[in-house]
């Protein structure tokens, strides 16, 4: 089947980089300046993302693929193909519509980004607080009081950090 | 096309002040939240004020509360930023920039950006 498509459809020997130009019986024809194809056998040519403003020029548009974009420093990229910037907030902060506001007692941040998460629950696993948590690091578990006898050294590193619940994707 | 147009930008002595204006074009303006963000020359991006979409909600960046006021006409579809007693360290690029779909619950992006309006607070 695809064999007699392609008899049938000249368009489909034309490769990413260019597309049939029915205007020109049906040739392959490059795409023009500030487009781009990135499949073979396409009738059009896709406009290039132009990075204006606040989003800058992470990779240049080719004939083969589109621009993408970053954002300013002091944001960052959210949202599929970086379409948002979101403001950056220090450690040990969350962003809020107010703002970056401080993380509550009890949580944490250790990111620019995402939200504060609930200090590891030592006791949960039978374990001891070894080091304090503050607003910008997890507390680290330690061993439990039992375990605290002679030779017995172990810590365990705290729990892995889950994503940061702040993206909309 | 979506497009945000800042216009009022200027030189200015400190203490003084200026009003910037944003016109939104090509959506519906009332129904988004709306921020104005700056640059000052050599730094990073900073966010200074929102709204939200009837004006009944307005938040501001610690360093010009008191003195900046963030308002809209969405019958016009323009956002405005009255500075008052403008310092030095006001100098920026200041943008409009609209609050994504999901704004205020799931993430704060803002996705319709201005190409910026110039503020040189100078004596």
């Known amino acids: 089947f695809e064999r007699t498509r392609s008899l049938q459809d000249p368009c489909s020997n034309c490769p990413a980089g260019t597309f049939c130009d029915n205007n020109r019986n049906q040739i392959c024809s490059p795409c023009p300046p500030n487009s781009f194809s990135s499949a073979g056998g396409q009738r059009t040519c896709d406009i290039c993302r132009q990075c204006k403003g606040v989003f800058r020029t992470r990779k240049e548009c080719s004939s083969t693929s589109n621009a993408e974009c970053d954002c300013t420093p002091g944001f960052h990229c959210l949202g599929a193909g970086c379409s948002m910037c979101e403001q950056d907030c220090k450690q040990g902060q969350e962003l809020t519509k107010k703002g970056c506001k401080d993380c509550c007692f009890g949580t944490f941040n250790d990111q620019k980004r995402g939200i504060c998460r609930p200090w590891t629950n030592c006791s949960l696993d039978g374990k001891s607080v070894l080091v304090n948590g503050t607003k910008e690091r997890d507390v680290v578990c330690g061993p439990s009081p039992a375990d605290l006898s002679p030779g017995a050294s172990s810590v365990t590193p705290p729990a892995p950090a889950r994503e940061p619940g702040h993206s909309p994707q | 096309e979506v497009q945000l147009v800042e216009s009022g930008g200027g030189l200015v002595q400190p203490g003084g002040s200026l009003r910037l204006s944003c016109a939104a074009s090509?959506?519906?303006?009332?129904?988004?939240?709306m921020n104005w963000v700056r640059q000052a020359p050599g730094k990073g991006l900073e966010w200074v004020a929102n709204i939200n979409q009837d004006g009944s909600e307005k938040y501001y960046v610690d360093s010009v509360k008191g003195r900046f006021t963030i308002s809209r006409d969405n019958a016009k579809n323009s956002l405005y930023l009255q500075m008052n007693s403008l310092r030095a360290e006001d100098t920026a690029v200041y943008y409009c920039a609209r609050g994504g779909e999901e704004y205020g619950s799931s993430h704060y992006g803002m996705d319709v950006w201005g190409l910026g309006t110039t503020v040189t607070v100078s004596s």
């Open positions: 090509g959506f519906t303006f009332s129904s988004y939240w």
